[in-house]
């Protein structure tokens, strides 16, 4: 029978670490991490790490009992967890019978938004105490709410990941810019900034009709030439406060009728914090 892995949590040092080993298996040949989505009961989904590793093809894998994987996450707070994946059978061949290296994977480490993860793996039995054993590590940075997978997470939706304000902005005259955007039921307060290397105008927008989408319009006084300036719209939603996903547009000249042109170069960018 071909070996498979059975993985479970192992927070402390592996018991083999306390024993003296004359010989140890070689290091891993490769270690990779990618995010995968799984559905959860609430109708939302969670993002997990798919950690896969490849064994070196030589006789030293005959000694291999397990591979231990540890993940450290660094964001607002630090997390640390390990799993030990035991091999169900001894290795009878250095490569898979069908060809190629022995490759295994573990899906289970949860992924938070916008977090840097350090993933380390080593084979067991590992080096003796006070010796450096062969190990492998990779970094993985999880994406934020603008990511095509993450943006549908409830946390991101509440931070406005699916909201398209469809900003239009035009220069009415030398002193004013008119900004129009579609509001969202997620919140009722917005800040519109006009930047042309420096901030040349801003305005708070309060939209009391929070329950439905409406088209809001605000005329903003400016202190410099506004044509080609950037409009940044910052929403204030309960879940993300002043660090919600920001949206951008560009100021053009208003047509003679005074109706602003629709913009097709809307851009979104996260604030300092991503949920």
């Amino acid at each position: 029978r071909e070996p498979t892995v059975q993985c479970g949590s192992e927070t402390g040092p592996s018991p083999e670490w306390m024993l003296q080993h004359d010989l140890i298996p070689g290091d891993l040949r490769d270690l990779r991490v990618e995010p995968v989505t799984t559905s959860v009961a609430t109708g939302d989904y969670s993002i997990l790490m798919n950690v896969s590793w490849v064994l070196r093809a030589d006789a030293s894998i005959r000694l291999l009992k397990a591979t231990k994987i540890c993940v450290t996450g660094k964001s607002n707070f630090q997390s640390y967890s390990c799993v030990r994946c035991n091999y169900t059978e001894a290795f009878q061949t250095q490569t898979r019978p069908s060809g190629g290296k022995w490759t295994f994977s573990y899906i289970g480490f949860p992924v938070e938004l916008n977090t840097v993860y350090f993933i380390g793996a080593h084979n067991i039995p590992n080096a003796n105490m006070n010796e450096d054993g062969p190990s492998m590590s990779v970094n993985f940075t999880s994406p934020g709410c603008l990511d095509h997978i993450m943006k549908y997470k409830k946390k991101c939706v509440k931070a406005g990941s699916l909201w398209d304000p469809n900003i239009t902005a035009c220069k009415k005259n030398e002193e004013t810019v008119e900004v129009n955007f579609t509001t969202t039921p997620l919140g009722n307060r917005y800040m519109a900034l006009i930047q042309h290397s420096t901030i040349i105008g801003f305005s708070q927008v309060f939209e009391p009709h929070q329950k439905k989408q409406t088209r809001a319009s605000v005329v903003i006084p400016v202190t410099g030439d506004s044509e080609g300036a950037t409009v940044q719209l910052t929403p204030y939603f309960p879940t993300c406060g002043s660090d919600c996903i920001r949206h951008k547009g560009t100021v053009v000249l208003c047509p003679q009728t005074g109706v602003p042109f629709p913009l097709d170069n809307n851009k979104s960018k996260p604030g300092g914090w991503l949920p």
């Epitope: 070689g26 030589d58 006789a59 061949t93 490569t95 019978p97 060809g99």
Partner: antibody, heavy 118, light 107 residues
């Protein structure tokens, strides 16, 4: 049955290169590493290196790292070893040898005698 | 690299005798050892792998033993077709190395 076929001999000039072939049959080519072994005149056996036909991973004996280039052609189930910048020291019989479950050499080619001479 | 020291380098024996060839590794190779026989002008042939396992078609008069760093190949009741050169080889981790060989000749 498993067969590894190698040409009998190659005569090459000093400084030139030669590409030795090892045509295989009778087994799944991508399932086993292919090794190359040198045997000098009246001498013992030296492992040159090995290649995994599945993904072309190569491991060399450091001594031959700048002398041998190992390749495979999966479509024709053949392994190749190019020897470069040949000198009289490279005159020897070169064998291809297929690994077993681990790297014992279960099957050997007949060997190619390479003679480096002006 | 692991060195394989084989002894004796040559051996002159008669048909029907028993011989033992030894091989010492410079470090523990965890029983990852093979033995080969080579006749003059021919390619080597696998005799034994994993110290004790006989390759297909190898007569039972051949046997291997050993562990750690010390290994041996025993040939009981030598036959005329057994004469030639014998090599040990470790396959613990690359680079793989062979012993210097033992030349077995008829007395």
């Amino acid at each position: 049955q498993v067969q590894l076929q190698q040409p009998g001999a190659e005569l090459v000039r000093p400084g030139a290169s030669v590409k030795l072939s090892c045509k295989t049959s009778g087994y799944t080519f991508i399932s086993y590493w292919m090794n190359w072994v040198k045997q000098g005149p009246e001498q013992g056996l030296e492992w040159i290196g090995r290649i995994d036909p599945y993904d072309s991973e190569i491991q060399y004996n450091q001594k031959f790292k700048d002398k041998a280039i190992l390749t495979v052609d999966k479509s024709s189930s053949a392994a190749y070893m190019q020897l470069i910048s040949l000198t009289s020291e490279d005159s020897a019989v070169y064998y291809c040898a297929r690994s077993g479950g681990f790297d014992w050499f279960a099957y050997w080619g007949q060997g190619t005698l390479v003679t480096v001479s002006a | 690299d692991i060195q394989m020291t084989q002894s004796p380098a040559s051996l002159s024996v008669s048909v029907g005798e028993t011989v033992t060839i030894t091989c010492r590794a410079s470090e523990n190779i965890n029983s990852n050892l093979a033995w080969y026989q080579q006749k003059k002008g021919k390619s080597p042939q696998l005799l034994v792998y994993d110290v004790t396992n006989l390759a297909d078609g190898v007569p039972s008069r051949f046997s291997g033993s050993g562990s750690g760093t010390q290994y041996s190949l025993k040939i009981n009741s030598l036959q005329s077709e057994d004469f030639g050169s014998y090599y040990c080889q470790h396959f613990w981790r690359p680079p793989y190395t062979f012993g210097g060989g033992t030349n077995l000749e008829i007395k």
